[in-house]
Interface confidence: low
């Protein structure tokens, strides 16, 4: 249980003292419009902040941009607004950081009307400086960094042409026209799809996508009546449309385009839409929307082809084309993933796997929460996960839930104890084992930031009053220290953290406002001196992920290995620090059904862990074609989950079947082909 | 640089089967498909089949179906070719050439085929009794 | 399956000439061929793909056009290390075929 700041609390001594000596104002003179806040590369203490505008604007009204720059974490600013030259930035593009430590920072300026093209700044020094250069089109999105190559720039124009720089935005080049989207892929190769009539709303579902590997000098196209593309892990996906209907269809190419296959999912119709919810190496997690306005659909789980798929959960909510999912990756904890169903009753309901989308369950009541109005029964009920959905609705949730990958086993957010997600203002809720066990954290909405890999949880209400109050936990949310950082309360509007969550540096913003006049203002606390000695071997204990049977010889194991990890005591008050590295012992587990999906062909009968043969597969929206004809596919029914690692225990071996099946798709097969030669 | 060394020369009898290596180095071995050709004593190219190293998906020529198997270990990014059921006109050079194509066509006015770009040195197999 | 057919079967070109070599496909194959370069004792050479592109590597005396059934490979000057047999081969529909050779030699 959680007990709050009741007695069994161990307080932090002296953390009053400490914070106060580590807590820097800084006032911003002058910033006006939106405020957006970056870092600049990993660990290197650098912050910038812009005021930026939208366009058109009223000139004489606000004044040029302003941008500033901080190399201590945001304990101090300095206002370099002339390294560009007072020019208006456009909100919408923002600041493009570069990819790892590259240093690089691109601005891209509103310049007046009648030019030729747009203008950016650009800087390679971690924003020391800035050049200006004048580009030959006018930017229509941000500039895009290559991943592999942080000199290799692309952009869109609003001309629809394909402009490219190989020299971090001095030169650019236009490489095509009439481009709708372009993406980069691996090894600095771009793909992006092209129209050829009118433009790309009115030729969506004939557009040709398109690849080339050395930037603009040559093309192939790869893929032609294409809806759209998407990228995710080492797959390549394009929605096509079919030949006689307006259905479309998922492609996937694990080659960068050379080669594609038909993915076993159903086809979808005008207005209906498929979305990539996760990817990876392995596999992938797709939504299928079904058909009408439902707001929901259903996920699948890919193979390691990204070919097969199984039905993963049904009814999952995912509003209607661009909307909103709170599908959400627990990256604390490996193969934990959570979003919410819309049950018949229109409720929504949060479900969590723990094994990658095999399996889905509701989350364990707390213990020291009770059940709610939504709950049937007042023993018995479930805690809801409020996510983007309940965000996108302006139910009071300032945050959608957090956790990282180096704070193991932490997730943190709003939630609800019910049988459904409640209307009521809800609570923060934290899980230290990745999901399985939850506890009240904090009553009423908060904005919450993990620090120094988890030793640290910092939390401030969310109040429509001015506020001058930050919480603190040291023991992952179990107790809570409170610390007013100023005399003069402000009207909050962020709570920010270097990326990754090694930082001990919190900075909080908001601004003052009195009858005339309202400024910025930033607050960064240094929680070093909290954690005021280095973290030994002592102060960490062993701890079995996914450990549900301590009993069970086969406890922890999922998808096909369990691991150990090296995690801080909660009752240690010390710092995991920078360099920290997550300590883990990973095992193989052997073999079972569990571990394989059923290939093509083959399904789970209910409650059964055996694949069994489709009676037929006729009126089944099951197609297979690798290769853009009829396809010998041979298979025991049985396919290793992906990423799955077991060894040993069962082998699902049985008689090899031979299947055949008709390629019926237009877009993997030229000429209609059958399995005899011609 | 990008290479497929394949296994030394076999002498076989009617009858018996030969397994082929390939091994590919230089590059990521699931990015590409990989062919396999053949070339009897003064005749020219025949192209037996194919394998996609992602899956292990295959497609073979009709005249090989049923005699030929193409298996791959990606732990050692290698490819196999069996070929079972051996007679004296199967005496030839076994080729493996890596084929960034693959066999699925993107569709009418988009096909671009890359063409077998690496080959293996080749592997003599003799059937004599 | 689709049927390549390479014309002449043998070339006989002196050094520095122009070479032309034919290959007519039994249904159209698009732009989707490739030739290759073959010397005695030694594994085939990716010349042109695509119908018409180079491969990495291959000089500029190479070319390739044509699409749909009728291709040719065109060498502008015979050099000394070009006599070889040259094939073509579709990737249209599988399976994937070869032309039956052409062997260019000094004359």
């Known amino acids: 249980s959680a007990p709050g700041e009741d007695e069994e609390c161990g307080r932090v001594r002296d953390f009053v003292a400490k914070l106060a000596n580590n807590t820097h104002q800084h006032v911003f003179d002058d910033l006006r419009g939106s405020v957006s806040l970056s870092w600049v590369g990993d660990s290197t203490g650098v912050i910038l902040v812009l005021t930026t505008f939208h366009v058109p604007l009223v000139i004489m009204t606000f004044g040029q941009s302003k941008l500033y720059r901080s190399e201590d974490y945001g304990k101090n600013f300095k206002d370099i607004t002339d390294l560009i030259n007072n020019t208006f930035i456009r909100t919408e593009f923002g600041m493009a950081i570069g990819p790892e430590n590259s240093g690089k920072v691109v601005l891209t300026a509103e310049v007046s009307g009648g030019s030729r093209g747009g203008r950016i700044f650009r800087s390679s020094d971690f924003a020391k400086n800035f050049v200006q250069t004048d580009l030959p089109f006018h930017p229509l999105t941000q500039m895009m960094y290559s991943p592999q190559n942080s000199d290799y720039l692309l952009a869109l124009s609003t001309e629809n042409g394909l402009w490219v720089s190989k020299n971090f935005g001095g030169k650019w080049e236009e490489i095509h026209k009439a481009v709708c989207l372009a993406k980069w892929g691996s090894d600095n190769t771009i793909f992006f799809t092209t129209y050829a009539n009118g433009s790309c709303k009115a030729d969506l579902g004939a557009l040709e996508l398109w690849r080339t590997s050395d930037l603009g000098k040559s093309f192939k196209t790869i893929g032609v009546k294409i809806y759209s593309f998407g990228l995710g892990g080492r797959f390549l996906f394009a929605s096509v449309m079919a030949d006689k209907d307006t259905t479309r269809r998922i492609h996937v190419s694990t080659d960068q385009g050379d080669t594609w296959s038909m993915a076993q999912l159903p086809s979808v119709g005008q207005e209906q839409f498929y979305s990539i919810l996760a990817a990876n190496d392995d596999m992938v997690f797709m939504h299928v929307d079904e058909p009408g306005d439902t707001g929901f659909g259903t996920i699948f789980t890919s193979d390691d082809r990204g070919i097969v798929y199984s039905k993963s959960l049904d009814r999952h909510l995912y509003t209607t084309t661009g909307g909103e999912t709170d599908f959400t990756n627990v990256t604390s904890l490996r193969g934990v993933y959570i979003t919410s169903v819309l049950s018949e009753d229109n409720s929504i309901q949060t479900m969590i796997t723990f094994d990658q989308g095999g399996r889905w369950t509701h989350l364990r009541k707390p213990e020291n929460s009770e059940c709610d109005a939504t709950a049937k029964n007042k023993n018995e009920c479930s805690l809801h996960i409020h996510a983007s959905y309940s965000i996108s609705q302006k139910l009071n949730v300032p945050m959608a839930p957090l956790s990282e990958p180096n704070a193991v086993g932490i997730v943190i957010a709003h939630g609800s104890v019910g049988d459904a997600i409640s209307v009521m203002v809800p609570d923060v809720y934290i899980s230290d084992d990745g999901g399985y066990s939850w506890t009240k954290m904090l009553e009423g909405p908060h904005y919450y930031t993990i620090l120094d890999s988890g030793g640290i949880i910092v939390a401030i209400e969310h109040s429509s009053r001015p506020i001058n109050v930050i919480k603190f936990s040291t023991d992952e949310g179990q107790c809570w220290q409170t610390y007013t950082f100023t005399r003069d309360p402000i009207y909050f509007t962020g709570l920010a953290s270097e990326p990754g969550a090694r930082s001990m540096n919190i900075s909080i913003w908001g601004f003052t406002a009195s009858f005339l006049t309202s400024q910025w203002v930033s607050y960064t606390i240094d929680f070093k001196d909290i954690l005021e000695r280095n973290c030994e071997e002592k102060d960490y204990t062993i701890w079995l992920a996914h450990s549900t049977d301590p009993e069970d010889y086969e406890d922890g194991c999922i998808l096909g290995y369990k691991e150990q990890f090296l995690r801080l005591r909660k009752s240690s008050v010390c710092q995991n620090g920078r360099d920290y590295v997550v300590t883990k012992q990973p095992s193989i587990c052997l073999c079972s059904l569990e571990d394989f999906l059923c290939d093509f062909g083959y399904y789970r009968p209910e409650n059964d862990s055996k694949c069994v043969e489709q009676p037929e597969l006729k009126g089944h929206d099951l197609e297979f074609c690798l290769y853009g004809r009829e396809e010998h596919l041979t298979t025991n029914g049985y396919r290793k989950i992906p990423g799955d690692k077991c060894q040993g225990g069962v082998n699902p071996v049985r008689e090899v079947k031979d299947l055949k099946k008709k390629c019926t798709s237009n877009f993997l097969s030229p000429e209609k082909q059958n399995s005899k030669s011609n | 640089q990008v290479q497929l060394v394949q296994s030394g020369a076999e002498v076989k009898k009617p009858g018996a089967s030969v397994k082929v290596s390939c091994k590919a180095s230089?590059?990521?071995?699931?990015?590409?498909?990989m062919s396999w050709v053949r070339q009897a004593p003064g005749q020219g190219l025949e192209w037996m089949g194919i394998i996609n190293p992602v899956g292990g998906s295959t497609s073979y020529a009709q005249k090989f179906q049923g005699r030929v198997t193409m298996t791959r270990d990606t732990s050692t990014s290698t490819v196999y070719m069996e070929l079972s059921s051996l007679r004296s006109e199967d005496t030839a050079v076994y080729y493996c050439a890596r084929d960034p194509s693959g066999i699925a066509a993107a569709g009418p006015a988009s096909r671009y085929y890359y063409g077998m770009d690496v080959w293996g040195q080749g592997t003599t197999v003799t059937v004599s009794s | 399956e689709i049927v390549m057919t390479q014309s002449p079967a043998t070339l006989s070109v002196s050094p520095g000439e122009r070479a032309t070599l034919s290959c007519r496909a039994s249904?159209?194959?698009?732009?989707?061929l490739a030739w290759y370069q073959q010397k005695p004792g030694q594994a085939p050479r990716l010349l042109i793909y695509g119908a018409s592109t180079r491969a990495t590597g291959i000089p500029a005396r190479f070319s390739g056009s044509g699409s749909g059934t009728e291709f040719t490979l065109t060498i502008s000057s015979l050099q000394s290390e070009d006599f070889a047999v040259y094939y073509c081969q579709q990737a249209r529909l599988g399976p994937w075929t070869f032309g039956g050779g052409t062997k260019v030699e000094i004359k």
């Open positions: 249904q159209s194959v698009s732009s989707n």
């Open positions: 230089g590059y990521t071995f699931t990015s590409r498909y």
